[in-house]
């Protein structure tokens, strides 16, 4: 019994004056609480509690279920307790079969004993299966058996409390341990698409997937820089024991331009938080932006190949693409493909392959593209570089020698005189007249140059060379002179093409 200091309130005293009392099933339990300020008796076992306002607690025929802690409390809130075991060979355990354990914490298998004198109070696996090697426990006849530091691997473990009675092992009813996992990492969050592009009035719907070990993970959709609560719908699944998935779907049924912005899916647990964002861009109407990938002014040599290449952004998807030259549409030699296979791709590539270009194929090549909202076009001006071609070389009636050459870039015509029979003409002759003529062909065709010299300046036999050249190459034509006495014979022109 507690010792009492004079003047201080003291706890009640209980008769019989023991901490533990063992009675047989069917016998009487009589407990007396002595205290001038007696208030009540309380009985506790497992989740059950009973009260009694009489200072004497009497149970005429004790049952195993009367096993438990009896506490007497006075008006000062001071109390004293006695633990009563009601020994019943037919019911060695009192059992609360609910068994939950938090990972890494201790949990109590609640199977208190009705007889403290049995031996080997412990846990056993069901159907003779061994317990996990690392499972440690501490038995307490009044409370049950404490499993230390519960592991995730113990989830769904089936076990019994066990004692030895008269040399035989007796098992309690079975317990199934349900382990509540501890959060050892932040939730895993992902979003159905990283960016969305919509026209006004279209529905915006985005799904965030949250994965964690249990359903107690918290998640929400937030709009960056806004406190507005967003409307979201949830679906969730348990894929096995510690694999929980939630899908949080955010919907704006008719998106407006001012709904554009960054939306964040946020999730947290006791370990930490994670988030993922998606960007919404709402445009009032669709668009097409074309970007040339080569210079829009193209110079290419006669007979060579060149690709006219554009990249373009189109939203919504492009519906019609075409390449046009001289009002004719190309049916082949071109291709159009998405820049990436990404579902949210809006960038495309179009290529027109011009092969073995001829001098006559210079001009404006136009790429046109349209979608349901807009049309767009881009033009390439293609110039085909060609070696000069001497179109005419004549002696005119006024005694002039005339040379007309065509090519691109514009040819330069030089004149040379070779006296006698020499093949190499080095003495240059200044032209009397040089003109660039308007070509009858397309504006991107060859440029025509006409140059004339006065043949009366030549007093000796020889050859006059008209040489037309540009960056691509050169071509020559020759006029032969022959004098008989003072008369100049008919001039014979001939050409020699020089690569």
């Amino acid at each position: 019994q507690p010792s009492v200091s004079p003047g201080e309130p003291s706890p009640p005293s209980i008769h019989p004056g023991k901490s533990d009392l063992i009675v047989r099933v069917g016998d009487e339990i009589r407990l007396l609480c002595t205290d001038p300020g007696f208030v009540k008796w309380t009985f506790e076992i497992l989740d059950e509690t009973n009260e009694n306002k009489q200072n004497e607690w009497i149970t005429e025929k004790a049952e195993a279920t009367n096993t438990g802690k009896y506490t007497c409390t006075n008006k000062h809130g001071l109390s004293n307790s006695i633990y009563v075991f009601v020994r019943d060979p037919a019911k060695l355990f009192l059992v609360d079969r609910s068994l939950y354990g938090k990972e890494d914490n201790d949990t109590l298998v609640r199977c208190p004993l009705t007889d403290p004198e049995v031996t080997n109070y412990s846990l056993k696996g069901c159907q003779g299966k061994p317990l996990p090697k690392d499972l440690r426990f501490i038995p307490d006849p009044k409370a049950g058996i404490m499993i230390k530091s519960v592991k995730r691997a113990y989830h769904r473990l089936c076990l019994h409390c066990s004692v030895d009675q008269e040399g035989k092992s007796v098992l309690s009813e079975k317990f199934i341990l349900k382990v509540r996992p501890a959060f050892k990492a932040v939730p895993v969050v992902s979003v159905s698409k990283a960016s969305y592009l919509l026209r006004e009035g279209e529905e915006f719907t985005v799904t965030c997937t949250i994965k964690d070990v249990s359903s107690s993970v918290y998640s929400t959709w937030k709009r960056e820089n806004s406190q507005t609560k967003l409307q979201e719908k949830y679906n969730s699944w348990h894929h096995g024991d510690f694999n929980y998935e939630r899908q949080a779907t955010l919907t704006i049924s008719s998106a407006r331009v001012n709904d554009s912005g960054v939306f964040m899916c946020y999730a947290n647990n006791t370990f930490g938080s994670a988030n993922v964002t998606t960007t919404l861009e709402v445009v009032d109407k669709g668009f097409i932006n074309i970007f040339p990938m080569i210079n829009t002014t193209v110079f290419v040599n006669d007979g060579e190949n060149v690709d006219l290449i554009v990249e373009y952004e189109a939203f919504p998807k492009p519906e019609h693409q075409q390449w046009i030259y001289m009002n004719r549409t190309f049916t082949d030699k071109w291709e159009d493909y998405p820049k990436s296979e990404n579902e949210s791709n809006i960038r495309y590539v179009s290529e027109l392959h011009l092969t073995r270009l001829k001098g006559t194929e210079g001009g404006t090549y136009t790429f046109l593209v349209s979608n349901s909202d807009v049309n767009a076009a881009i033009a390439f001006n293609v110039y085909v570089n060609t070696k000069p071609e001497i179109l005419t070389y004549d002696r005119l009636v006024n005694g002039m020698l005339q040379c007309v050459a065509a090519g691109f870039p514009e040819p330069t015509i030089d004149w040379y005189f070779c006296p006698g029979t020499e093949q190499r003409c080095s003495a240059s002759v200044l032209p009397v007249d040089v003109q660039t003529l308007n070509s009858s062909g397309p504006p991107f065709g060859k440029l025509v140059v006409q140059s004339s010299i006065d043949s009366s300046a030549f007093k000796h036999n020889g050859t006059v060379e008209c040489k037309a050249y540009n960056d691509v190459g050169k071509t020559s034509a020759y006029f032969n002179f022959a004098f008989k006495g003072n008369n100049k014979e008919q001039i014979h022109p001939h050409t020699l093409f020089t690569p």
């Epitope: 970007f291 080569i294 210079n295 690709d307 290449i309 082949d332 392959h353 092969t355």
Partner: antibody, heavy 117, light 112 residues
Framework: EVQLQQSGPELVKTGTSVKISCKAS????????MHWVKQSHGKSLEWIGY????????TYNQKFRGKATFTVDTSSSTTYMQFNSLTSEDSAVYFC??????????WGQGTSVTVSS | EVVVTQTPLSLPVSFGDQVSISCRSS???????????LSWYLHKPGQSPQLLIY???NRFSGVPDRFSGSGSGTEFTLEISTIKPEDLGMYYC?????????FGGGTKLEIK
């Protein structure tokens, strides 16, 4: 005459990076894409990607994304390829090549890169 | 990615022989516009590869007419009508329709 002149051989250390060049002449540089191709010793050719010589836009083979970086200097008609975080697997001959009509019509002479530890 | 398989790996020849090299792709090389970007290259030791044929059958400028290309869809062939010494080397086909572009494994043309 179209010519693609590449920089000389490189001997580099593991973990470093290398930048090789390809100087074009004989044609309108900005009218074409430049592609880069890898040939490991005794192996076939492998396409790395390409760059627009007009505006520097790039496309990479997924396998080389993050490993190769293309740049262009239009004033000198030169394209560059930088290879990062080099390992022995990157030891190879690298070619630049001009592309038209879905084919590579002119090639550089190749640049040998040897990665040593 | 499109896998391009070239056969044979090695082709021993005598000068004057006619030979063909096959190139097979794991999917059709014809795009939705009807274009097929299949080209052939000759790579001689110490030199850069040179384009022979583009667009299945178009000879590149300066390529002798003893070289010809044919095929469609997934099966393509390079033919050399009369082998000359300068034709020896490694031959590669390239598909330029689907990214990433892929080369065949190569065929070594060597003297018997």
């Amino acid at each position: 005459e179209v010519q693609l002149q590449q920089s000389g051989p490189e001997l580099v250390k593991t973990g470093t990076s290398v930048k090789i060049s390809c100087k074009a002449s004989g044609y309108s540089f900005s009218n074409y894409y430049m592609h880069w191709v890898k040939q490991s010793h005794g192996k076939s050719l492998e396409w790395i990607g390409y760059i627009s010589c007009f505006n520097g836009a790039t496309t990479y083979n997924q396998k080389f994304r993050g490993k190769a970086t293309f740049t262009v200097d239009t004033s000198s008609s030169t394209t560059y390829m930088q290879f990062n975080s080099l390992t022995s697997e990157d030891s190879a001959v690298y070619f630049c090549a001009r592309r038209t009509a879905g084919a590579m019509d002119y090639w550089g002479q190749g640049t040998s890169v040897t990665v040593s530890s | 990615e499109v896998v391009v398989t070239q056969t044979p790996l090695s082709l021993p020849v005598s000068f004057g022989d006619q030979v063909s090299i096959s190139c097979r792709s794991s999917q059709s090389l014809a795009n939705s516009y009807g274009n097929t970007y299949l080209s052939w290259y000759l790579h001689k030791p110490g030199q850069s590869p040179q384009l022979l044929i583009y667009g299945i059958s178009n000879r590149f400028s300066g390529v002798p007419d003893r070289f010809s290309g044919s095929g469609s869809g997934t099966e393509f062939t390079l033919e050399i009508s009369t082998i000359k010494p300068e034709d020896l080397g490694m031959y590669y086909c390239l598909q330029g329709t689907h990214q990433p572009y892929t080369f065949g494994g190569g065929t070594k043309l060597e003297i018997k």
